[in-house]
Interface confidence: medium
């Protein structure tokens, strides 16, 4: 049965969704305002954002007394969304106040702003490294879901109708479907990864869904208003059940499993793709792009960053 990893503002927790006694285990406590959470399964690493401390932090699972490490501690204001590229070994995040989407190495180095224009309230972010795409929600004045290459290329709005407060976002990697929750319109919908063939999953009976994740045939989501975690069948919306209630303040949620992070080889593995700094996955040939930290230019060879990086 799936392990659910979730941020609970003052801590990050784990719960076995299929357990007989549904009790959550604290992964890390004493936090200010943990909002977004993700993991790197192969290393047992957990990453989260803290919107009060304006930071991205990290710890390790299954390591007694594992220290909390700072990953990014400057230039953030409200890092609402976070996603770990487990293949390219990068962190992607959204910030709803600086209105940016950024990427960096897992240790926070070689940080690059990918998008800084036409963003209002970017929130959830999800990755499909196998195809080199990233997806995010924006619940600003023009609510929408967008898609772009993980290298910042080919940005496109894929959902902009019947949408108001798109909060949760997750990808069904096997079936190549995008799921999202709308807190204002009280629904969970799904569509193809280009936004086509949209379908209802749950409608009308949600209070304030915030984050969304998936395992097998089951969707899991957190609800701000009821302060609980719920589940249902990903296709029909049936088999609704409450997984955990009376939580402090459940925020982002992930299914902690190898299945959610299937491994495959990329050109970035071999000598960092020949890149001096960032090797970012891309949806188009050669399926990777060399990039430089913000403020540093790429040389004409397309691989090396100019001095000062």
């Amino acid at each position: 049965s799936p392990l659910l990893l979730f941020a609970n503002r003052r801590d990050v927790r784990l719960v076995d969704a299929g357990g007989v006694k549904l009790e959550s285990t604290i992964v890390v406590s004493g936090l200010e305002d943990a909002a977004a959470v993700d993991f790197q399964f192969s290393k047992g690493a957990v990453y989260w954002t803290d919107v009060s401390e304006e930071a991205i932090k990290q710890t390790y699972l299954n390591q007694t007394g594992a220290a909390v490490q700072n990953v990014v501690i400057s230039g953030l204001v409200s890092p609402d969304g976070l996603a770990c590229d487990w293949v390219g070994k990068k962190l992607y995040w959204t910030d709803s106040e600086t209105n940016r989407i950024e990427v960096a190495n897992l240790n926070g180095t070689s940080r690059k702003v990918l998008f800084w224009q036409d963003l209002d309230q970017p929130r959830a972010i999800a990755l499909d490294p196998a195809h080199g795409y990233m997806y995010w929600t924006d619940w600003g004045e023009t609510p929408r879901i967008e898609r772009a290459g993980m290298d910042g290329s080919t940005r496109k709005i894929i959902v902009d109708s019947d949408i108001y407060w798109p909060n949760g976002l997750t990808i069904d990697l096997e079936e190549q479907k995008l799921y999202w929750a709308d807190a204002k319109l009280s629904f969970i919908h799904r569509a193809n990864l280009d936004g086509s063939f949209r379908q209802k999953v749950v409608e009308g009976s949600l209070t304030h869904p915030f984050a969304l994740t998936l395992s097998g045939d089951t969707l899991y989501w957190t609800d701000w208003q009821t302060r609980s975690i719920h589940a249902c069948n990903k296709r029909t919306g049936g088999k609704r059940k409450e997984i955990l209630s009376a939580l402090y303040s459940p925020m982002d949620i992930q299914v902690l499993s190898q299945e959610r992070q299937p491994f495959f080889h990329t050109r970035c593995e071999e000598d960092n793709g020949g890149c001096s700094h960032l090797c970012l996955l891309s949806p188009s040939e050669p399926f990777y792009t060399c990039a430089c930290p913000t403020g540093v230019q790429l040389q004409d060879n397309g691989r090396t960053c100019k001095a000062g990086a």
Epitope: R9, E32, D33, V51, S52, E54, V77, S78, S96, E97, Q121, W139, G140, W165, Q225, S249
Partner: nanobody
Framework: AVQLVESGGGLVQPGGSLRLSCAAS????????MGWFRQAPGKEREFVAA????????YYADSVKGRFTISRDNSKNTVYLQMNSLRPEDTAVYYC?????????????????????WGQGTLVTVSS
């Protein structure tokens, strides 16, 4: 539970100033974002301003931006609303609110369910 008590309201002429205070008790004040709302007669309660727990970030409704300033003193468990250049349309009952989180967008700040604790309000009348 957190108890909130507002003070500082009263009658003021257009163009004048007032400073509202909200004293909190019964909880760890620094754990809460604080906000001010107002409700004019016959109208819905509307968001005015909010401040993060640390005091590092503040947020304002467009109608008060540049005129009102929210601040907090965590050592005194008090949040303030300094109101300058007051206008007749600022006349309302002003409420203090507390929440364990604050959003940057007024879409969330205006959601009254989002704010967990409320004061009883203090009346501000702007009239000549």
């Amino acid at each position: 539970a957190v108890q909130l008590v507002e003070s500082g309201g009263g009658l003021v002429q257009p163009g004048g100033s007032l400073r509202l205070s909200c004293a909190a008790s019964g909880g760890t004040f620094s754990s809460y974002a604080m906000g001010w709302f107002r409700q004019a007669p016959g109208k819905e309660r509307e968001f005015v301003a909010a401040i993060r727990r640390s005091g590092r970030r503040t947020y304002y409704a467009d109608s008060v931006k540049g005129r009102f300033t929210i601040s907090r003193d965590n050592s005194k468990n008090t949040v303030y609303l300094q109101m300058n250049s007051l206008r007749p349309e600022d006349t309302a009952v002003y409420y203090c609110a507390a929440a364990r989180r604050v959003r940057s967008s007024t879409r969330y700040n205006t959601g009254t369910w989002w704010w967990e604790y409320w004061g009883q309000g203090t009346l501000v009348t702007v009239s000549s």
